[in-house]
């Protein structure tokens, strides 16, 4: 859930007031706010559906909710990409699409979403509780991944509800000079704002509404999402084919769009460098990668002179790491 | 820099079979899909199928589904193609490509002859 | 499995001129989904592999001439080179990106007068 914040307007102290020093500490902070509060984090969604007619055919959904390009999709099983998980299909935008057995179509809803299905016939079908993971990589945001299973419970027919992926992986991949000075920014602002706590407060003048109001995006989940996130973690069955993961299942909820928060801790890593994090008390892992992603063996999405976002496989023209196209 | 090496040539008779290799280097081998395709001297090219290392399974033009076996080795990073019962109609450069043909072999030339 | 066809399969030209070459598909390379061609060009000069020049019908691979210019949308498409080069001699083919089996054109030859 997104929400709108609007961040006051710093009235000019008086001059001579606080000097050069004292206006740069006024106009510092109030940069670095605005950086924070604009870095918004992007969300991945993932849905997971069992055909009536087909009982071991699976159609996964996925969609990236970010303002960056996306410039490669891959869909894997039995875990996120690269952890354990097998690539099933590798959406580019521009390049094409490819698919490996059991996928039988996989294919671009919008822009942002894509769609996979799965026929279950032999040794590589799906089961119920197989985990689905699906990884956006887009510009300049990184990679996102965020994976889903079917509730073990789940009629043939129904759809798992989009609520918060069991297994959220971000790849912090865009810009780590960025994201450095970001989160430099904002320890230095918190540093900033505790050391003026005992001076007087600078006038503040409420900003008009505009459409520059920078956005602050909060993570709220809805019930359906607090109550999926709280389901204690569960040991998948591992006689299904692809290995899988011990992963919550979320359980029923309202909506079958709820988005899945792909919320990650900036965690200063090596490029490459995975850290899983259980968090028990909701049910999920985080995984955070940071790193130059060069578009592995992909063409690069337009990131201008220097900088190229690198999933391997020609990622579709695909990235560096598990996946790739191109 | 990501490279693609394969053998300059293998000679063949008629009714045997060719395993032919496309080594990797440069790039991490289980992230992108190697593609195989056929040239026939003075033809055009056509596209035999593809195979992801990552999760070793194939797609294969349906022309090509009794004639070529696609496998890969991650160890070593090379992917293989075997064409079996091979007739004068085999006789081609045979090229793989990483990914989206971003990169390209330089090409195996497999004469059928007896 | 989708045909495509290239004309002319051969031209000769002098350098410095204008060269433009078609390929038609015969069913739609469009993806309905995010409106993007599924077709790409490729460069082939003798006794070499092929060499990626375009991509999604109209974007240039990374390290391609800018005289190279893809355009068209569904079925019909065209390769542009603005000013032939002596080094472009080579063969082109169009290549359905769009759906397996990933067919190629018959290519279509250019020669330099």
């Known amino acids: 859930m997104r929400t709108e914040a609007q961040v006051p307007a710093l009235q000019p102290p008086e001059p001579g007031l606080e000097g050069a020093m004292g206006h740069r500490t006024l106009v510092l902070p109030w940069v670095l706010l605005t950086l924070c509060v604009t870095a918004g984090t992007p969300e991945v969604w993932v849905q997971v559906r069992m055909e009536a007619t087909e009982l071991s055919s699976f159609t996964i959904r996925c969609g990236f909710l970010g303002s960056g390009s996306i410039s490669l999709v891959t869909v894997s099983w039995g875990g996120p990409n690269g952890a354990g998980g097998t690539t099933l299909a590798v959406l580019h935008p521009e390049r094409g699409i490819r698919q490996w057995a059991p996928a039988r179509q996989a294919r671009w809803e919008t822009q942002s979403s894509i769609s996979l299905i799965l026929e279950g016939s032999g040794a590589s079908s799906p089961c119920a509780n197989t985990t689905f993971c699906c990884k956006f990589a887009s510009f300049p945001e990184g990679s996102w991944e965020a994976c889903g299973s079917l509730p073990p419970s789940s009629d043939p027919g129904l759809s798992a509800p989009p609520t918060p992926a069991p297994i959220l992986r971000a790849d912090l991949a865009g810009i780590l000079g960025v994201s450095g000075v970001l989160l430099f920014g904002c320890v230095y602002l918190l540093h900033l704002l505790r050391r003026h706590k005992h001076r007087p407060a600078p006038r503040l003048q409420p900003s008009r509404t505009s459409p520059q109001a920078p956005r602050a995006r909060a993570w709220a989940p809805s019930q359906a999402s607090q109550a999926a996130l709280h389901v204690p973690y569960a040991t998948i069955n591992t006689s299904c084919r692809p290995a899988t993961l011990d992963t919550a299942h979320p359980h029923g909820g309202p909506s079958w769009w709820a988005s899945l928060p792909t919320h990650a801790a900036h965690r200063p890593q090596g490029p490459a460098a995975w850290a899983s994090t259980p968090i028990p008390a909701r049910g999920s892992f985080v995984s955070v990668e940071n790193g130059l992603y060069a578009q592995a063996g992909e063409r690069p999405p337009h990131t201008g002179p220097g900088l190229t976002l690198f999933p391997d496989p020609r990622g579709p023209r695909a990235m560096e790491g598990p996946l790739g196209v191109r | 820099q990501a490279q693609l090496q394969q053998p300059g040539a293998e000679l063949v008779k008629p009714g045997a079979s060719v395993k032919m290799s496309c080594k990797a280097s440069g790039y991490t081998f289980t992230s992108y899909w190697i593609t195989w395709v056929k040239q026939r001297p003075g033809q055009g090219l056509e596209w035999i199928g593809d195979?992801?290392?990552?999760?070793?399974?194939?797609n294969y033009n349906e022309k090509f589904k009794n004639k070529a076996t696609l496998t890969v080795d991650t160890s070593s990073s090379t992917a293989y193609m075997q064409l079996s019962s091979l007739t004068s109609e085999d006789s081609a450069v045979y090229y793989c490509?990483?990914?989206?043909?971003?990169?390209w072999g330089t090409g195996t030339t497999v004469t059928v002859s007896s | 499995d989708i045909v495509m066809t290239q004309s002319p399969s051969s031209l000769s030209v002098s350098a410095g001129e204008k060269v433009t070459m078609s390929c038609k598909s015969s069913?739609?390379?469009?993806?309905?989904?995010?409106?993007?061609?599924?077709l790409a060009w490729y460069q082939q000069k003798p006794g070499q592999p092929p060499k990626l020049l375009i991509y999604?019908?109209?974007t240039r691979e990374s390290g391609v001439p800018d005289r190279f210019t893809g355009s068209g949308s569904g079925t019909d498409f065209t390769l542009t080179i603005s000013s032939v080069q002596a080094e472009d001699l080579a063969v082109y083919y169009c290549q359905n990106d769009h759906s397996y089996p990933f067919t190629f054109g018959s290519g279509t030859k250019l020669e330099i007068k």
């Open positions: 490509a990483k990914g989206y043909f971003d990169v």
């Open positions: 999604g019908a109209s």
């Open positions: 195979i992801y290392p990552g999760n070793f399974s194939p």
């Open positions: 069913q739609s390379l469009l993806n309905s989904g995010n409106q993007k061609n599924y």
